[in-house]
């Protein structure tokens, strides 16, 4: 039987992204996002 391991040898990188709210509207302040594996998830 084949043995399946969760550890595939790949590392998923994450990076915090900061945007200014006024770039997309009239609000002030910063919008914090998180990019995981090339996809912004928050």
């Amino acid at each position: 039987d084949a043995e399946f391991r969760h550890d595939s040898g790949y590392e998923v990188h994450h990076q915090k992204l900061v945007f200014f709210a006024e770039d997309v509207g009239s609000n002030k302040g910063a919008i914090i996002g998180l990019m995981v594996g090339g996809v912004v998830i928050a």
């Epitope: 915090k16 900061v18 945007f19 006024e22 770039d23 002030k28």
Partner: nanobody, 124 residues
Framework: EVQLVESGGGLVQPGGSLRLSCAAS????????MGWFRQSPGKEREFVAT????????YYADSVKGRFTISRDSAKNAVYMQMNSLKPEDTAVYYC?????????????????WGQGTQVTVSS
């Protein structure tokens, strides 16, 4: 694109202060979010602080929060960074940069225009 020229760097003792200036050329200055980054030998360029087009929003790296203040004067096409309570680990070349609307303002690669940098050395 805008052209950027930094000034104000120098040698300062720990606990001291410096004020960096960034002069921008071009009539589109208010179309850019502006940021300061720094790079020390052997390390990647790191985000320090950024200010929005209007000057109404700012964001800082945790390492400088409460010590550094970024501001801009659109009438003079200039960006400033007041640096107080300087530490030896703040020693680096400091760069001013401009990012277009909608860019992630803490990521160096999102900035299209860069100055030549100004050296800040904190040492006794």
């Amino acid at each position: 694109e805008v052209q950027l020229v930094e000034s104000g760097g120098g040698l300062v003792q720990p606990g001291g202060s410096l004020r960096l200036s960034c002069a921008a050329s071009g009539r589109t200055f208010t179309s850019y979010n502006m940021g300061w980054f720094r790079q020390s030998p052997g390390k990647e360029r790191e985000f320090v602080a950024t200010i929005s087009r209007s000057g109404g929003s700012t964001y800082y790296a945790d390492s400088v929060k409460g010590r550094f203040t970024i501001s801009r004067d659109s009438a003079k096409n200039a960006v400033y960074m007041q640096m107080n309570s300087l530490k030896p680990e703040d020693t680096a070349v400091y760069y001013c940069a401009a990012a277009r609307i909608g860019a992630a303002v803490n990521i160096p690669s999102e900035y299209g225009s860069w100055g030549q940098g100004t050296q800040v050395t904190v040492s006794s």
